[in-house]
């Protein structure tokens, strides 16, 4: 029975189950294409455990292979606006360190109004993860429409 | 080697890795936008290591972060049918107890055939999950097109 | 603290935390369907931690549950294009050895230019993974448009 | 066919406040992006502000930000503008504009509604 | 912010063809907005008129017809507005609007009288 005491003594940070789930507060600025997001059990079912907001961008705390997915859903959307709106892009990636700048999962809003799409990816503690949106529209705000998590995998 | 051994000796359930595959069954009646799920090996690939099938909707027995995914293709579709039938919307949530009640994940099919996606959210013994396909069009019950399942990621 | 010092001492392959991610190395010759894949830290963010690659194709080597994840963008493409080149369809599946040959996962591309999805599914040592590309658009080579990985769950 | 019919217009004195309203019909009003816009004495347009599904969003221009506030009860399908601490400079002919799938377009307008700001 | 320009008035005859422009500030790129069109008679609301990123990406507004169509002009950074087969009943104000996450600027309108 000893691992599992020992599991239940140790915190769960040790056992690099480092994992966050975060809901979009708010857009940039004109000129910025980032999307900014917020987590916590008080706005609702999102969280971090490990990873950290820096500014509404997520900044991870342990190396490892993390999981990394997201939706982004459009606020006004439908299939007749999708076909016709302004090419709509969202991009997730690394963003600082700048020497560690990457592009990890890009997607494209064809003539669709939702992306959803998750990828395995080495990260590194200090990395500040990025979710870039370009285009003229506004995502949606629903929490089960749009949000973005990390999930530490292994070493 | 001491890990390794009580790693084995422990029953993986107290480890914590719930984890449960589901295959299409039936839809609901017309007033009941339910998907009804099955799972088990003599289905071919679906299974459930921890959570149980109640009526085709699943429940949870250990309280945790899921990653909860699902994947539904319509059954006799194009990108013109998807687009004329209008709203189609599948939405994942708890639906029992009462209580916990929330929407967990919603996409809609405007010009397409196969909505896909998946996040992290907190769930709790007793949790069930419902799976609310709006619309009138019809799901394909092939295994590898249409499917819903959790991962218990971390208490 | 003797878990966390017998996790550091055992290797990472005996906690079964297979897992690979990889890209897009090159399309076959025009009968042959299917994607051909590669990994490693010299081409970027694709890896192999157990799992192998034998002629660009995925072979798993440890039983248990995998979570099988997929993005692949089309690579001149607009939501015109998807449309006239339909059907355009993406399958996961086992494909050797051939007694266990079995299509896991099936997208088109309807009016989109990109798919992307997952699925939890147990597979076997030995199980090799083909994921094959049927129209005749071609894959986008770019590392976060195309990728292909899978993380081992459970026994 | 998306409609609007504004009112609530009048003669307000300067510091004074009002709210106009404008009720909406033939269109999922909840899933649209909703906009006043006014036309001075002779001008041009000017946008105001909006506000874009489920009341998720809202933006104002620079002229009118704090002023002025966005709002809408979905159960009625009605859009609201409360304009407080009201200026001569704000005396106009305020349009509702809907747009039932798009939001950066103003499709559907209504005949106006005046308001004047003097003493 | 994003400003736009519009010339005060155009002139052209019934039959011929006009176009409207509404250039963006050096600031901004017309590629970055959505440039829609509005046109309002005296006395009458404006009606939307249409839209335009490319032509694939357009849109026309219910009852307009064809014979007013966009364009843009990257060079100029200016968003068109193209009548062909100019008739008297297209006399009227013509305003431009550029939109970007959640914010409209509208030109200052240009007048079109019909000779």
């Known amino acids: 029975q000893r691992f599992a005491q020992a599991q239940q003594q140790l915190p769960l940070e040790s056992l690099g189950w480092d994992v966050a789930e975060l809901q979009l507060n708010h857009t940039g600025p004109q000129q910025d294409p980032r999307l900014y997001w917020q987590g916590g059990p008080a706005l609702g079912r999102s969280f971090l455990h490990g990873p950290e907001l820096d500014k509404g961008q997520l900044r991870i705390h342990r190396d490892g292979i993390y999981m990394v997915h997201i939706q982004v859903t459009l606020a006004i959307c439908s299939s007749t606006t999708a076909s016709r709106h302004h090419p709509t892009t969202l991009a997730v990636g690394i963003c600082s360190p700048a020497s560690r700048s990457i592009s990890l999962l890009r997607l494209s809003f064809h003539q669709g109004c939702t992306i959803a799409s998750q990828r395995l990816t080495p990260l590194a503690r200090g990395d500040t993860l990025c979710t870039n949106l370009t285009g003229t529209l506004l995502p949606s705000r629903n929490t089960d429409e749009t949000f973005f998590g990390v999930q530490w995998v292994r070493p | 080697q001491r890990f390794a051994q009580a790693q084995q000796q422990l029953p993986l359930e107290s480890l914590g890795w719930d984890v449960a595959e589901l295959q299409l069954n039936h839809t609901g009646p017309q007033q009941d936008p339910r998907l009804y799920w099955q799972g088990g090996p003599a289905l071919g690939r679906s299974f459930l290591h921890g959570p149980e099938l109640d009526k085709g909707q699943l429940r949870i027995h250990r309280d945790g972060i899921y990653m909860v995914h699902i994947q539904v293709t319509l059954a006799i579709c194009s990108s013109t049918t998807a687009s004329r039938h209008h709203p189609t919307t599948l939405a994942v949530g708890i639906c029992s107890p009462a209580s916990r009640s929330i929407s967990l994940l919603r996409l809609s099919f405007h010009q397409g055939c196969t909505i896909a996606s998946q996040r992290l959210t907190p769930l709790a013994r007793g949790d069930t999950l419902c799976t609310n396909l709006t619309g009138t069009l019809l799901p394909s019950r092939n295994t590898d097109e249409t499917f819903f399942g959790v991962q218990w990621v971390r208490p | 603290q003797r878990f966390a010092q017998a996790q550091q001492q055992l290797p990472l392959e005996s906690l079964g935390w297979d897992v690979a991610e990889l890209q897009l190395n090159h399309t076959g010759p025009q009968q042959d369907p299917r994607l051909y894949w590669q990994g490693g830290p010299a081409l970027g963010r694709s890896f192999l931690h157990g799992p192998e690659l034998d002629k660009g194709q995925l072979r798993i080597h440890r039983d248990g549950i995998y979570m099988v994840h997929i993005q692949v963008t089309l690579a001149i493409c607009s939501s015109t294009t998807a449309s006239r080149h339909h059907p355009t369809t993406l399958a996961v599946g086992i494909c050797s050895p051939a007694s266990r040959s079995i299509s896991l996962l099936r997208l088109s591309f309807h009016q989109g230019c990109t798919i992307a999805s997952q699925r939890l599914t147990p597979l076997a040592r030995g199980d090799t993974l083909c994921t094959n590309l049927t129209g005749t658009l071609l894959p986008s080579r770019n590392t976060d448009e195309t990728f292909f990985g899978v993380q081992w769950v459970r026994p | 066919q998306l409609q609007v019919v504004e009112s609530g217009g009048g003669l307000m004195q300067p510091g004074g406040s009002l709210r106009l309203s404008c009720a909406a019909s033939g269109f999922t009003f909840s899933g649209s992006a909703m906009s006043w816009v006014r036309q001075a004495p002779g001008k041009g347009l000017e946008w105001v502000s909006s506000?874009?599904?489920?009341?998720?969003?809202?933006y104002y221009a620079d002229s009118v930000k704090s002023r002025f506030t966005i709002s809408t009860d979905n159960a009625k399908n009605t859009l609201y503008l409360q304009m407080n601490s009201l200026k001569p400079d704000d005396t106009a002919v305020y349009y509702c504009a809907a747009s039932s799938d798009y939001e950066g377009l103003f499709v559907s307008w209504g005949q106006g509604t005046q308001v004047t700001v003097s003493s | 912010q994003a400003v736009l320009t519009q010339p005060p008035s155009l002139s052209a005859s019934p039959g011929s063809s006009v176009r409207l422009t509404c250039t963006l500030n050096?600031?901004?790129?017309?590629?970055?907005?959505?440039i829609s069109w509005y046109q309002q008679k005296a006395g009458s609301p404006p009606r939307y008129l249409l839209y335009y990123y490319s032509d694939s990406l357009s849109h026309q507004g219910s009852g307009v017809p064809s014979r007013f169509s966009g364009s843009t002009d990257a060079s100029a950074n200016a968003g068109l507005l193209l009548i062909s087969g100019l008739q008297p009943e297209d006399e009227a104000d013509y305003y431009c609007?550029?939109?970007?996450?959640?914010?409209?600027?509208f030109g200052g309108g240009t007048k079109l009288t019909v000779l």
């Open positions: 609007s550029a939109y970007n996450r959640g914010s409209h600027v």
């Open positions: 506000i874009y599904s489920h009341s998720m969003y809202t």
């Open positions: 050096s600031a901004n790129s017309v590629g970055s907005y959505d």
